[in-house]
């Protein structure tokens, strides 16, 4: 049954909201999709989770959630926020997850984010953000996940990322980014997942991925690359690479020599005509390789050291004979 404390907790539940104990003598409060235009006023000080998403909240006053020192997750997605003032999150010392996606923010709310030292996950996707100030994440030393996809960014906010050394996953997809400069992510040594798909990226700095020593997943799909992304050569832990739906015409010799951990490579929907014979050597974890329409391939690829392929598809090539060693190279 419920303890006396949970009864006290539930008496602090705002009207029309759904509340339940979270198992730690704290309260989960769901006020989503209620047509609210402002924050509820009678929130329990013991609230650990507050969902205010899918309402009509258009502004936050400074310090709108006083005393919620146990609040760990705040959801404000799907409202009409255009601006978040300094002090909007004052006193939220335990806040780990902040969801601000699907609003109308034009800038990262730099001042409001200051001193959220416990914040681990920040969603700013699906807004109208075109500018990320250099110091906007400077106090977010615990941040692990950052969503900036589906905004209006035209360039990588290089300086803003310098303070995010604990970041593990980030998405910058669905923006209007056209170039990735050298050392764009130079301090993100803990980053494991980076999504850059659906941008307008046509050029990569020679050292644009330098510093990403933990990166395992890189998504460059649906961009305007017309050259193979040789900058990946520094990503020694890369497991999953996508650059499909670009304009890449050739894959050079030893293309993936710096990426011996690759398991998956997606590069379909590119007008690839040439593939270096040594391009896919020494990829012991690679399981699937599909080369469609590479019309200038005249020799079967040298798969030395790529011994665990389970599926190999070659269509549209001009290979006239198979090497005698082909059956030795494949499992």
């Amino acid at each position: 049954g419920s303890s006396p404390r949970s009864g006290v907790l539930l008496r602090g539940c705002p009207t029309h909201c759904h509340c339940e104990p979270d198992g730690r003598m704290l309260l989960r409060v769901d006020c989503s999709d209620l047509g609210l235009s402002e924050l509820p006023s009678n929130l329990s000080v013991f609230t650990s989770y507050l969902d205010l998403s899918m309402n009509n909240i258009s502004q936050l006053l400074p310090n709108p959630l006083p005393s919620l020192r146990f609040l760990e997750e705040l959801r404000l997605a799907g409202n009409a926020l255009t601006y978040i003032p300094k002090g909007a999150f004052t006193g939220l010392y335990s806040l780990k997850v902040l969801m601000l996606q699907n609003n109308q923010l034009r800038h990262v709310p730099t001042e409001a984010l200051q001193n959220l030292r416990s914040l681990q996950s920040l969603r700013l996707d699906a807004n109208h953000i075109s500018y990320v100030p250099p110091s906007c994440f400077s106090g977010l030393h615990s941040l692990r996940h950052l969503w900036l996809d589906d905004n209006a960014l035209t360039e990588i906010p290089v300086q803003a990322f310098r303070s995010l050394s604990a970041l593990q996953a980030m998405t910058l997809a669905l923006n209007k980014i056209h170039h990735i400069p050298d050392y764009a992510f130079g301090n993100l040594s803990s980053l494991v997942v980076l999504h850059l798909h659906n941008n307008r990226i046509h050029s990569l700095g020679k050292k644009c991925f330098d510093g990403l020593h933990s990166l395992e997943t890189l998504d460059l799909n649906y961009n305007n690359l017309d050259e193979f992304p040789t900058a990946i050569r520094t990503l020694s832990n890369l497991k999953e690479l996508g650059f499909h739906s670009n304009n890449i015409r050739s894959i050079p010799e030893k293309a993936f020599v710096g990426n011996p951990s690759l398991i998956t490579i997606h590069f379909y929907d590119n007008p690839i005509q040439f593939v270096g014979r040594s391009a896919f050597q020494h990829l012991p974890e690679l399981r699937t390789l599909t080369l469609n329409g590479a019309s200038q391939i005249t020799e079967f690829p040298d798969l030395t050291g790529t011994a665990n392929l389970e599926s190999l598809t070659l269509t549209g090539a001009q290979i006239s004979s198979l090497p005698q060693t082909v059956c030795n190279q494949l499992p």
Partner: antibody, heavy 118, light 111 residues
Framework: EVQLVQSGAEVKKPGASVKVSCKAS????????IEWVRQAPGQGLEWIGE????????DYNEKFKVRVTITRDTSTSTAYLELSSLRSEDTAVYYC???????????WGQGTLVTVSS | DIVMTQSPDSLAVSLGERATINCRAS??????????MHWYQQKPGQPPKLLIY???NLESGVPDRFSGSGSGTDFTLTISSLQAEDVAVYYC?????????FGQGTKVEIK
């Protein structure tokens, strides 16, 4: 602990070649650029070139391009600098260094003195 | 090539006093808000040691009496309170573009 240990001093005659080694330990050798820099006696520092061991990618200072070859052996985590057609003005201490944060040179070898003299 | 010019060539400062070294690049070394300028200390018979990266970021383990500032073409290394162990030659270096280039060095001595 990151360490770069270079080969010993060399004395060469003009026109000869020299190959200096740099053995790395304490980090993932393949993922960081190795830079080569030289310092003539009493002089400043001069960048020669770099290699990314994981991919064998190299870049050279145009000044040295025709005479310098930078290679690596990933099995022993060792980078090499070979300089040919030596002349007296190549007398210098040759350093290898790791390209660290934003390309700054965060760890250096102890240096190898190459003396070119007839 | 980008030419790096340091001033002064040498500097004598009393113990505990401030030492300031300037470095000017022949063109901007800034890119997307980062200044690709680094500072090194070299003592006799030793390899250089990284002090500051990206113009103003203190390398780990370096005493906080060292600081860097500047952007574009003009940069400064400051030692707020000179210690005896700071006697050395100091170099700035750019890696904004190949070839990477160093300043000629500034010798810091005790007055």
């Amino acid at each position: 602990e990151v360490q770069l240990v270079q080969s010993g001093a060399e004395v060469k005659k003009p026109g000869a070649s020299v190959k200096v080694s740099c053995k790395a330990s304490g980090y993932t050798f393949s993922a960081y650029w190795i830079e080569w820099v030289r310092q003539a006696p009493g002089q400043g520092l001069e960048w020669i070139g770099e290699i990314l061991p994981g991919s064998d990618s190299t870049d050279y200072n145009e000044k040295f391009k025709v005479r310098v070859t930078i290679t690596r052996d990933t099995s022993t985590s060792t980078a090499y600098l070979e300089l040919s057609s030596l002349r007296s003005e190549d007398t210098a201490v040759y350093y290898c260094a790791r390209g660290g944060h934003y390309g700054s040179l965060d760890y250096w070898g102890q240096g190898t003195l190459v003396t070119v003299s007839s | 090539d980008i030419v790096m010019t340091q001033s002064p060539d040498s500097l004598a400062v009393s113990l505990g006093e401030r030492a300031t070294i300037n470095c000017r690049a022949s063109e901007s070394v800034d890119n997307y808000g980062n200044s690709f300028m680094h500072w090194y200390q070299q003592k006799p018979g030793q390899p250089p040691k990284l002090l500051i990266y990206l113009a103003s970021n203190l390398e780990s383990g370096v005493p906080d009496r060292f600081s860097g500032s500047g952007s574009g073409t003009d940069f400064t290394l400051t030692i707020s309170s000179l210690q005896a162990e700071d006697v050395a030659v100091y170099y700035c270096q750019q890696n904004y573009e190949d070839p990477f280039t160093f300043g000629q060095g500034t010798k810091v001595e005790i007055k």
